[in-house]
Interface confidence: low
């Protein structure tokens, strides 16, 4: 765990002069309006900034926007508005940046009311040049790039047409009408739902799910009576209306919709919803809403086919469809997720799982913190994390929890220490071991970001007053230095650093305000001179992830294997560098019952690792739908957890027989599917 604050804090030598030489101010020649910022490519240093200006600051009939470009991580910006013919760019579409390092950018322009179609500006050279293209339609959504080929774009029109371009937006073709939702799948496949009668809203629950694998030359109807669909990992999900009533069920396909199986999940009524919380190629976390306006539901975790589900967490906080949930994937340690539950007394509590949803527990109380007023027992309480729900409730929480895959073990979040989340002003807490232990890092709410793969953490106090001070730590949040980056304080609006946390540059965005005018300003600080040297072997130490009992031979085993990482020592002040790769050494564990989830028809009683038969299914043949056929399951109740790599040890028996019978309950059986060509 992170060492306490009683350790001596060594100061970084001469940091003021070093940072002053590497602080770059840019004042934008704009009244305030709004600003959006995008990185173009990875490690290119190219940033695009779009400022748009319209009411409420000044009355004018048209907005105006300006486009700026930096190629040195934000230290200097050049006004390139002339490259887009001084056109007003629509902020609701954002800047559509191409995948990987394609260097592609699409900006959508505002056009006058009577025009035949919209207008876009396209760049394929990291925004050095733009080509204006008039569209044969008015876009409803941002242009979506195919993940496999950045020349392929799709967009929906305001008339609900599905438009595709094969040459990066130069020419467009309408491949289908009456389309509600469209998404790229793998291998340049497009999935989309269509309506037949009136509109997407009117036909909800009667939509058809279509697929094209050749950009609109031919189509296949892969589902009917569709309410909605989603893609997660290698899974395609559809929620499908039942024949006899207004309920709907989730169906899942792992072959792009050719065959479907009904997920063993509860059906939901009109007012309820399903939500894919997280998905990878192994499994999916699915939230199923409770009946009534409860604000909570149940998390289920899937098997490797997305069909058999185990109940993972009850009373999971999730407010209405498209509402707020605190579900957070802790990307700095495998298998770790944090979320909130709504307890019987309507208080909100944070739960954490270290084994991909197998077991959930409260967060351990930080050593250096007292229990607050929400705690019944002043010595026993937990840390509760503020995330999306708190932010939506306008609590004083400027940021959601933060973790980065290359800053191993580090999690930073706002929280309170008690029996439940408190509405009082939160503090900032850090974990350096993926959420097992926590330390109070900063007093009061802050914005924070991770630089140099965890080598530097930067924070700025959240305040309604203008600010001019930034804080930084080179030892994972134990000790902090403060740096005054400007004499004239600014109204702070955001911290920006290159996605991926490999950069050593941070941009502080805000605005200055004088009588009736306000201007955007950014300060970019490069920390390269603080971390003077490159890290060497001696700067790293071996760390066993998920270690809770060093005496135990199986210590650190999660999902069938343990991992040792090389971690930067807290005392080392050096650069991990942009090319830093996390070094880890995995080793396989013996199987135990913990490596298996309960199979269909079985469940785990609380505090028991054995799976027992569900009472209502005792003595019944276990039959379920798979690919539109009925299967007979012979099992002693266990199925290996998706992604679990254990070998040897416990090995429960399991056998599935094909009953050669059709499933009447499967609305997506292949017989109902058809194909057509354009």
């Amino acid at each position: 765990s992170a060492p306490g604050e009683d350790e001596e804090c060594g100061r970084v030598r001469d940091f003021v002069a070093k940072l002053a030489n590497n602080t770059h101010q840019h004042v934008f020649d704009d009244l305030r309006g709004s600003v959006s910022l995008s990185w173009v490519g990875d490690s290119t240093g190219v940033i695009l900034v779009l400022t748009t200006f319209h009411v409420p600051l000044v009355i004018m009939t048209f907005g105006q926007s300006k486009l700026y470009r930096s190629e040195d991580y934000g230290k200097n910006f050049k006004d390139i508005t002339d490259l887009i013919n001084n056109t007003f760019i629509r902020t609701e579409f954002g800047m559509a940046i191409g995948p990987e390092n394609s260097g592609k950018v699409v900006l959508t322009a505002e056009v006058s009311g009577g025009s035949r179609g919209g207008r876009i500006f396209r760049s394929s050279d990291f925004a050095k040049n733009f080509v204006q293209t008039d569209l044969p339609f008015h876009p409803l959504t941002q242009m979506m790039y195919s993940p496999q080929n950045s020349d392929y774009l799709l967009a929906l029109s305001t008339e609900n047409g599905l438009w595709v371009s094969k040459n990066f937006g130069g020419k467009w073709e309408e491949i289908h009408k009456a389309v509600c939702l469209a998404k790229w799948g793998s291998d340049n496949t497009i999935f989309f739902t269509t309506y037949a009668n009136g509109s997407c809203k009117a036909d909800l629950g009667a939509l058809e799910l279509w697929r094209t694998s050749d950009l609109g030359k031919s189509f296949k109807t892969i589902g009917v009576k569709i309410y909605s669909f989603g893609l997660g990992g290698r899974f395609l999900f559809a929620s499908v209306m039942a024949d006899k009533d207004t309920t709907r069920r989730i169906h899942v396909s792992t072959d792009q919709g050719d065959t479907w199986s009904m997920a063993q999940l509860p059906s939901v009524g009109q007012e309820q919803f399903y939500s894919i919380l997280a998905a990878n190629d192994d499994m999916v976390f699915m939230h199923v809403d409770e009946p009534g306006d409860t604000g909570f539901g149940t998390i289920f975790t899937s098997d490797d086919r997305g069909i058999v589900y185990s109940k993972s967490l009850d009373r999971h906080l999730y407010t209405t469809t498209g509402g707020e949930t605190d579900f957070t994937n802790v990307t700095s340690l495998r298998g770790v997720y944090i979320t909130s539950v709504l307890s019987e007394d309507n208080s909100i509590q944070t739960m954490i799982t270290f084994d991909q949803g197998g077991r959930w527990t409260h967060l351990r109380k930080p050593e250096n913190s007292e229990c607050d007023a929400t705690a019944k027992n002043k010595n026993e309480c937990s840390l509760h994390i503020h995330a999306s729900y708190s932010i939506s409730q306008k609590l004083n929480v400027p940021m959601a929890p933060l973790s980065e895959p290359n800053a191993v073990g580090i999690v930073i979040a706002h929280g309170s220490v008690g029996d439940a989340i408190s509405v009082m002003v939160p503090d900032v807490y850090i974990s350096d071991d993926g959420g097992y232990s926590w330390t109070k890092m900063l007093e009061g709410p802050h914005y924070y970001t991770i630089l140099d793969s965890g080598g530097i953490i930067v924070a700025i106090e959240h305040s309604s007053r203008p600010i001019n001070v930034i804080k930084f730590s080179t030892d994972e949040g134990q000790c902090w230095q403060t740096y005054t980056f400007t004499r004239d304080p600014i109204y702070f609006t955001g911290l920006a650093s290159e996605p991926g946390a490999r950069s050593m540059n941070i941009s502080i965005w805000g605005f200055t305000e004088s009588f009736l005018t306000s201007q955007w300003v950014s300060y970019t600080i490069d920390f390269k001179d603080i971390l003077e040297r490159n890290c060497e072997e001696k700067d790293y130490t071996i760390w066993l992830a998920h270690s809770t009992d060093p005496e135990d031979y199986e210590d650190g085993c999660i999902l069938g294997y343990k991992e040792q990482f090389l971690r930067l020592r807290k005392s080392s002040v050096c650069q991990n560098g942009r090319d830093y790769v996390v070094t880890k050494q995995p080793s396989i564990c013996l199987c135990s019952l913990e490596d298996f989830l309960c199979d269909f028809g079985y469940y785990r009683p609380e505090n028991d690792s054995k799976c027992v038969e569900q009472p209502e299914l005792k003595g019944h043949d276990l039959e379920f739908c798979l690919y539109g056929r009925e299967e007979h399951l012979t099992t002693n109740g266990y199925r290996k957890i998706p992604g679990d790599k254990c070998q040897g040890g416990v090995n429960p028996v399991r056998e599935v027989k094909d009953l050669k019978k059709k499933c009447t309950s499967n609305f997506l059986s292949p017989e109902k599917q058809n194909s057509k060509s354009n």
């Epitope: 709004s34 009411v55 609701e92 305000e513 005018t517 306000s518």
Partner: antibody
Framework: QVQLVQSGAEVKKPGASVKVSCKAS????????MSWVRQAPGQGLEWMGI????????SYAQKFQGRVTMTRDTSTSTVYMELSSLRSEDTAVYYC??????????????????????WGQGTTVTVSS | EIVMTQSPATLSVSPGERATLSCRAS??????LAWYQQKPGQAPRLLIY???TRATGIPARFSGSGSGTEFTLTISSLQSEDFAVYYC?????????FGGGTKVEIK
């Protein structure tokens, strides 16, 4: 709780000026813009303008340009609306309304429109000779 | 300026019935639209913002829909306390403008 309390009713002669105050409480004053809306007897709502409590920048409807002045005092969390050269058609109830269209600290991204979510009780201004 | 037109000017409905109010903008306001309710002698009250999101504390019988130039406020089952004047308001371009209002009265 969040509330806006306006000053009392006023009776003015044509050609005079009136200054209506609106005191905010229960939230961070500098985080939200404030709009002023008026309603003549038996008529609909008419937007007059908006003020940003940070910096005090303003934006007025064309109809009131040159006659209206909106100011604020952050030390007392109060916004003022002064209307000059009054005429009989200015007889109306004047409302201040919190307008989160520019939540001043909501960050750079445009976040859509939230509506005027908190209104003052209204101040009746009567212009009569 | 953007002109907001509400129809009908008056709507006579019996309690328990459904009421549908329309609002049309002279040019697109995207979803930057709000609906307000006003009762005699009271300040307006925000019902719907962002064209379709219910404000805090507003009953589920009120719903808003539409985008661009055509918007609808629906009251699924009128209660006695719902008889009032309803206004739409755009915030796409300055100046903010209101519709003329629809009076919902008891039939």
């Amino acid at each position: 709780q969040v509330q806006l309390v306006q000053s009392g009713a006023e009776v003015k002669k044509p050609g005079a000026s009136v200054k209506v105050s609106c005191k905010a409480s229960g939230y961070t004053f500098t985080k939200y813009y404030m709009s002023w809306v008026r309603q003549a007897p038996g008529q609909g709502l008419e937007w007059m303008g908006i003020i940003n409590p940070i910096g005090g920048s303003t934006s007025y409807a064309q109809k009131f340009q040159g006659r209206v002045t909106m100011t604020r005092d952050t030390s007392t969390s109060t916004v003022y609306m002064e209307l000059s050269s009054l005429r009989s058609e200015d007889t109306a109830v004047y409302y201040c309304a919190r307008d989160p269209s520019g939540i001043a600290l909501a960050g750079p991204a445009s976040r859509g429109y939230y509506g005027m979510d908190v209104w003052g009780q209204g101040t009746t201004v009567t212009v009569s000779s | 300026e953007i002109v907001m037109t509400q129809s009908p000017a008056t709507l006579s409905v019996s309690p328990g019935e459904r009421a549908t109010l329309s609002c049309r903008a002279s040019q697109s306001v995207s979803s930057n639209l709000a609906w307000y309710q006003q009762k005699p002698g009271q300040a307006p009250r925000l019902l719907i913002y962002g064209a379709s999101t219910r404000a805090t504390g507003i009953p589920a019988r009120f719903s808003g829909s539409g985008s661009g130039t055509e918007f609808t406020l629906t009251i699924s089952s009128l209660q006695s306390e719902d008889f009032a004047v309803y206004y739409c308001q755009q915030a796409r371009l300055g100046p903010w403008t209101f519709g003329g209002g629809t009076k919902v009265e008891i039939k």
